[in-house]
Every structure is written in C-alpha cells, then in structure tokens.
C-alpha cells in the first residue's frame, strides 16, 4: 500500500467563454481508496478556492459555472490526490478561458440539390451557429468546415468555409447518396465535434464536372468564384 500517484489535469474546455470544465487523470491509487480535490486561484489573487462543482462534468472533473468564470483572468489550478498513506499533487495548470473554447457543433444543417435552368446543378448547404455562442457581442468569430462523402466511401472530402454559414459544391457523383457534416471553431480555440450527418441523394442526371468546383464566397445572391482543383487544395483540411 502506497500514497497515490501523481494526477494530471489533461483538458479544460469551455463551450462559450461563460462556463468551463477541467478533467484530470488519476495517478496510481496505491491500492487504497483515493480522494481527489481541485483547488485554484486566479492570477493576482492570494486566496485559494476549491472546485465549486465536481458533478456536472462527470468523474474526475471540475465545472466552473457562470459566476466562477472570468474571461480576463488566468486560473492557476492543481489536483490533490489523498489516501491513508499520503498525498500527491498534479503540476499546476494555467488556464485562460479565451483559449479553451470548444463550441457545440453547428445546428440545422440543411442540404439541397439545386438545379437552375441556366447554370450547372450544385449542392447547397446551410447551417446555424451553435446556440450557446453569442456572435452579436463580437467576442466570437466562428470558422466553419464541411466534410462530405458518398455513403460507401472511406475518405471524406473536406472544405473550409471561413465565416460563411452557406456553401455550394459543384462536383459530385451522380446517383450517389452523400453524407454531409459541418463543424466550427472560434478564432482561438478548438474544433467542435462534427454535426450529425445529413444525407442527400444526388440525382442520376446531376452533371459531373471534374475540372471545377463552385464555392460561394458570399451569400447566395452574392458574387461566386470558380476555383480550380489546384487552388482548392488551399481550402482542404483532411
């Protein structure tokens, strides 16, 4: 029987800069029941506080609700593991909420095949930002990425959409059923999970064009750019 091994705070994430959660990995338990506590202080403060909520984030976590989350302060935190034989402390972790944002996936992904009379058909997709994110404050710039593939294909084709919430793709395989997903990330922070897949059946009479793909830079009424396959590699993130 031994004192517990050193725990490690391995991840802190915030969905929206208003709350955040940190998770730790226990060290070895030393063969005895072990209690964990997370303590923190904000840089410039002398008082230490203990985690306000060990429940919300699941096992080995600490959740900081709105009243405990400050965007403009760095949190200094550590985890203490204690059993009957002794204690051990994690390394201190410095957390700035601005840089740990991982939004929820975008919502309401809509995908349609558009077949205008005067132009080539294209796949049009539209989505909404995650609800928890308030883009009106200007605190957030969200960037989007789309991926799609035929249902039975192994490889995804990925497109960077910038700040747009609409996107067009021209080059698709006729008669195939496609899966489409979208994800987002703030300017500083982490990519969200991919949204649930939306399925779209491409009609058999869809005109294939291997040379070019059409990407909308503006909204649907705005200017459109033809981008060659070569240029498109700059937009790819596999």
């Amino acid at each position: 029987q031994l004192p517990p091994g050193k725990p490690e705070i391995f991840k802190c994430r915030s969905p929206n800069k208003e709350t955040f959660t940190c998770w730790w990995r226990p060290g070895t338990d030393g063969g005895l029941p072990t209690n964990y506590s997370l303590t923190y202080h904000r840089e410039g403060e002398t008082l230490m506080h203990e985690c306000p909520d060990y429940i919300t984030g699941g096992p080995n976590s600490c959740h900081f609700g709105k009243q405990y989350t400050s965007m403009w302060r760095t949190y200094v935190m550590m985890v203490n593991a204690t059993n009957q034989m002794g204690s051990s402390f994690s390394d201190e972790l410095y957390v700035d909420v601005t840089y740990i944002v991982q939004p929820d996936p975008p919502l309401e992904l809509t995908v349609e095949v558009k077949q205008p009379e005067d132009r080539k058909p294209y796949l049009w997709m539209k989505w909404s930002p995650p609800t928890l994110i308030d883009l009106k404050t200007g605190w957030f710039t969200l960037l989007y990425e789309i991926r799609l593939k035929p249902e039975k294909a192994a490889e995804w084709e990925t497109h960077f959409a910038g700040q747009q919430t609409e996107f067009k793709i021209l080059s698709l395989h006729p008669g195939q059923k496609y899966l489409v997903q979208v994800r987002c990330k703030p300017d500083h922070g982490y990519w969200s999970a991919w949204s649930p897949a939306t399925f779209i059946q491409i009609p058999s009479d869809f005109i294939m064009n291997d040379e070019q793909k059409l990407i909308s830079e503006e909204d649907l009424g705005g200017e459109q750019k033809l981008i060659s396959e070569e240029d498109l590699h700059h937009h790819h993130h596999h």
Epitope: H49, E50, C51
Partner: antibody, heavy 118, light 107 residues
Framework: EVQLVESGGGLVKPGGSLRLSCAAS????????MNWVRQAPGKGLEWVSS????????HYADSVKGRFTISRDNAKNSLYLQMNSLRDEDTAVYYC???????????WGQGTLVIVSS | DIQLTQSPSFLSASVGDRVTITCWAS??????LAWYQQKPGKAPKLLIY???TLQSGVPSRFSGSGSGTEFTLTISSLQPEDFATYFC?????????FGGGTKVEIK
C-alpha cells in the same frame, strides 16, 4: 428559498465543549465554501473559520486555532463547528454563512447564541 | 493580518440624505471587499461585493467604489429602512476580516 439554520448553542462553563450545527436547504450545498462568523454582544463581526466544498481547504482565525474544528457533511447538507476549551471571550452569536467564491458571504443563518460562563 | 478601519463609527442622518461610509485597508486588497447591512437582532445582509457590484435584490440607491486600500459605500437617498449598522469585509487573504462597523442613526 435558501435557508441556513444554526443549532447547538447554549450555556457552557469555561473549559467546556459545544458542537454547533448548520442545516442548509434550498442550495446545492456541496458547491459552496461555508463559514462560521461570530458576534459578541454589542460588538462587531469576527470571522471564525471557513471550509471549502470537499473540505480540502480549511482556515481558522488565530483566536480559535487549536480549539475549534470546522467540518461538513455534504450528504446531509450540514456544517459543523466543534468548540473545545471554551473561554469567556467565545461568548457570542455564531452565524453560519455561505461563501459564493465569486462574491462574498451571500446567505447567513439567523445565528445561535453561545454563552461561556461559570 | 489585514486591518479594516471604518469611518465614521456613528453617523446621524435624515431620510433623503446622501450618506457615505469609508473603509480603509491596512494593505492593498485589490477589489476584494464586501459591504453588509445588519439590523438589531438580525443576521448581516450582503449589499455589495467585489467593491462595486450590487447584490441581487439590493436597491440601487446603494453603491460601492474604490480599490486597493480605500473604499466607500454610498446611500444616495437614505430611506427609513436603511437605519442600521454597516460593515465592510476583506476577502483578499486569510484571516478574513471585518471593519468595526458604522451605525447609521436617525437625526
């Protein structure tokens, strides 16, 4: 509605012991640090002790260090103060108070009177 | 330990008066100061925290200001229910300490 109710006060001789309790309701008790604050008759407020959410951080005023022990039972939504080696100067109304770490002592009980006298 | 000195200790005022209470800290405490109101036989009630943030449900005639070592509590227009004793408290470091109190009485 948040309620903190102290109990356990009374008359005790110098050198004696007493255990105060504070029962919390209407709050997620385990999410808050808790405190004991006392007020001698006609005097100001004196902070006595604080205990963090899982009891990993405990602090005492110098005047009670070594004599008083703060503890909590999150399963019972209860805070305790074990007071040993009581002195005349420990006579006071004892309040339990919730500490919102983002703010201050935002909820207080009604207090329980401890009289130390021979 | 950080000492808090409140001034004045007693204050006589009339309904409608503007009242200012000052709290000095013996060393810098940033903005970690709270103000409480206490009426006879009752528990203290939180008015202001982090020097200037009004606690929910507290009338807007109460305001707080200051940082470092000098802080003020202002009641813009004294109401009959405001006659009470007011305490400041520092939450910057242990031991947590309170000021000696300011009793606001009817003139």
């Amino acid at each position: 509605e948040v309620q903190l109710v102290e109990s356990g006060g009374g008359l005790v001789k110098p050198g004696g012991s007493l255990r105060l309790s504070c029962a919390a309701s209407g709050i997620t008790f385990s999410s808050y640090s808790m405190n004991w604050v006392r007020q001698a008759p006609g005097k100001g407020l004196e902070w006595v002790s604080s205990i963090s959410t899982r009891s990993s951080l405990i602090h005492y005023a110098d005047s009670v260090k070594g004599r008083f022990t703060i503890s909590r039972d999150n399963a019972k939504n209860s805070l305790y103060l074990q007071m040993n080696s009581l002195r005349d100067e420990d006579t006071a109304v004892y309040y339990c108070a919730r500490w919102d770490a983002a703010a201050a002592f935002d909820y207080w009980g009604q207090g329980t009177l401890v009289i130390v006298s021979s | 330990d950080i000492q808090l000195t409140q001034s004045p200790s007693f204050l006589s005022a009339s309904v409608g008066d503007r009242v200012t209470i000052t709290c000095w800290a013996s060393q810098g405490i940033s903005s970690y100061l709270a103000w409480y109101q206490q009426k006879p036989g009752k528990a203290p009630k939180l008015l202001i925290y982090v020097a200037s943030t009004l606690q929910s449900g507290v009338p807007s005639r109460f305001s707080g200001s200051g940082s470092g070592t000098e802080f003020t509590l202002t009641i813009s227009s004294l109401q009959p229910e405001d006659f009470a004793t007011y305490f400041c408290q520092q939450l910057n470091s242990y031991p947590l300490t309170f000021g000696g109190g300011t009793k606001v009485e009817i003139k």
